[in-house]
Amino acid sequence: LVVTPPGPELVLNVSSTFVLTCSGSAPVVWERMSQEPPQEMAKAQDGTFSSVLTLTNLTGLDTGEYFCTHNDSRGLETDERKRLYIFVPDPTVGFLPNDAEELFIFLTEITEITIPCRVTDPQLVVTLHEKKGDVALPVPYDHQRGFSGIFEDRSYICKTTIGDREVDSDAYYVYRLQVSSINVSVNAVQTVVRQGENITLMCIVIGNEVVNFEWTYPRKESGRLVEPVTDFLLDMPYHIRSILHIPSAELEDSGTYTCNVTESVNDHQDEKAINITVVESGYVRLLGEVGTLQFAELHRSRTLQVVFEAYPPPTVLWFKDNRTLGDSSAGEIALSTRNVSETRYVSELTLVRVKVAEAGHYTMRAFHEDAEVQLSFQLQINVPVRVLELSESHPDSGEQTVRCRGRGMPQPNIIWSACRDLKRCPRELPPTLLGNSSEEESQLETNVTYWEEEQEFEVVSTLRLQHVDRPLSVRCTLRNAVGQDTQEVIVVPHSLPFKV
């Protein structure tokens, strides 16, 4: 590339016209501030290409860099570029204007930076000061670039004198950013929503001041973009948050939402994903099974638990024999439904010191505007058995009878046993079971009655002994699921003068 005049620095008069020419073996173009100003391009007979840039009515604002470059660098060995710097001293222009990117200088490490205050005249003396400070800072100045050095987090201005007036530049703000490795967390207000409701997700990064967020989500794949909002959660260390909000969700919005965070300074990145489910309508579903018959033990506390899934949050009611239950002031009943995860619930009915009257038909109903579920079971109150009576009698028939009466829930079993050697029973000799043989020695008759009001069974059993020739220890044992009880009586022969 050949540039005329060759530069590399030119000082031109204000209001004048000046022509710059660039030529090369391939198409060439002049560039100014990353743009191509109007210019005349030509191709000579010898095959060389040229571009002529005519600068007319020059002002101080024409001060700056001009580049000549190949129009299409493909196929060329070098991406050659010629730089020319033009000054147009102009007393009406103090410092050249800066855009916002130049006024705020962000750093991530201690490094040399340039405060780009530039004047139109290379002869001017320019000094650097802290903003609102008078003392000039000892930093080298390049008229084409500005002040270069290592700067603290402060604001700075440049000063020069044009004629008899002092001119200040805009203030330049130097700020050191915090960067570190990236750790991302993603959460959603709800991971399950009904169609028409909103999806709101938050992606949070801690400890970095400069990050870019990128979300991928089902809607994006179909070209329907949603603009996330980024803000500071504003705790120390820095918490930065990006919020993705999708109003009026559709079924197609179900799927994986991924937040990718990059930090360009050190090229760190991290991403996290979360699944969102959009349902057509709400639901309530029982989890696990609860048997239709449940048990509680008299005077003990019992908690009945139902686990279910629901969205949106349901109302939960408990009923006993079709009457609504509530927490009792006496503390006999406690109801609680707790959210163990976003859509999973545990509802508990606690009966404190269970009473017989609390047996009955229980129903839990969970419902909202879209769905409902109910679960019913019978609650049986188990009562430990008690032997209420054990008596012996001598009917005229000559046989001897022993009667045992007891109660309990569930229905008690009765076991009769006897021991003939009083000295060694029951420690050394096991008692003999009675009534389960066809021997004529003994006969057994048992009757069972269910008492509705007390909700328990009564067992009455009569043991008939044919001939008792020596004292006999007879034992009645009642047993059910929650306990057992035993009583004992000594049966003596008719001929003996005593009985116990």
């Epitope: 204007p97 800066n98 855009d99 916002a100 990117e101 006024l103 705020f104 962000f106 200040d168 805009d170 203030a171 703000y173 700020y175 950013l177 001041e209 400069v210 990050v211 870019n212 967020f213 909002v229 980024t230 803000d231 500071f232 959660l233 504003l234 705790d235 120390m236 820095y238 918490h239 930065i240 990006s242 930090e263 360009s264």
Partner: antibody
């Protein structure tokens, strides 16, 4: 040298309109966010609105949304506040201020305060 | 909107005193807080930005501290020129809110 001068204030009836102007000098106006802040005499400061360098982003306090509009003309180094549907509670001194909001760093803005203020212009809404 | 609460509303002090003004945000604002000084009939003047950074030209007797929700402006030795009203101001997601102000007057 760096200066902001407000104008356009005055007495207006409730429901009326007014247009405030702010003339900037001594700095590259087109490189800065700008804000309007108001102050009821004897009371505290209330931020009203702000806008970015090219006017593509504008933000307002809730109480003025839909009634007050911020705008700018960079070639004229001027900031404006169009006030419609004025109410008695809009009576205040209105200040124009330079808002130090750097270009986005990553996905968000930094903030270094309002470093240059005008002297204010009084708006009185009364019948 | 984020609310800013300053205390006290009025503070009486003498030249040479150490003066402390506090500002509390209704939610965390990191260190996005500025302090301003205003004298009667004048426009506010920026003193401190980003909670603790002193604006150029502001005397070093002014200092700011705090982050999250609780912030403090301290004047280490009150001077005659410092009798004024002081305001804190937060920045969060493009909006700004000022505190109600603290008037520092002569005891």
């Amino acid at each position: 040298q760096v200066q902001l001068v407000e104008s356009g204030g005055g007495l207006v009836q409730p429901g009326g309109s007014l247009r405030l102007s702010c003339a900037a000098s001594g700095f590259t106006f087109s490189s800065y966010w700008m804000s309007w802040v108001r102050q009821v005499p004897g009371k505290g400061l209330e931020w009203v609105a702000n806008m970015n360098q090219d006017g593509t982003e504008k933000y307002y306090v809730d109480s003025v949304k839909g009634r007050l509009t911020i705008s700018r003309e960079n070639v004229k180094n001027s900031l404006y506040l169009q006030m419609n549907g004025l109410r008695a509670e809009d009576t205040a001194v209105y200040y124009c201020a330079r808002d130090l909001v750097p270009p986005r760093q990553g996905d968000y803005y930094y903030y270094f305060g309002m470093d240059v203020w005008g002297h204010g212009t009084m708006v009185t809404v009364s019948s | 909107a984020i609310q800013m609460t300053q205390s006290p509303s009025t503070l009486s002090a003498s030249v040479g005193d150490i003066v402390t003004i506090t500002c509390r945000a209704s939610q965390s604002i990191s260190d996005w807080l500025a302090w301003y000084q205003q004298k009667p009939g004048k426009a506010p003047k920026l003193l401190i930005f980003k909670a603790s950074s002193l604006e150029s030209g502001v005397p070093s007797r002014f200092s700011g501290s705090g982050s999250g929700t609780d912030f403090t402006l301290t004047i280490s030795s009150l001077q005659p020129d410092d009798f004024a009203t002081y305001y804190c101001q937060q920045y969060n997601s493009y909006s700004r809110t000022f505190g109600q102000g603290t008037k520092v007057d002569i005891k």
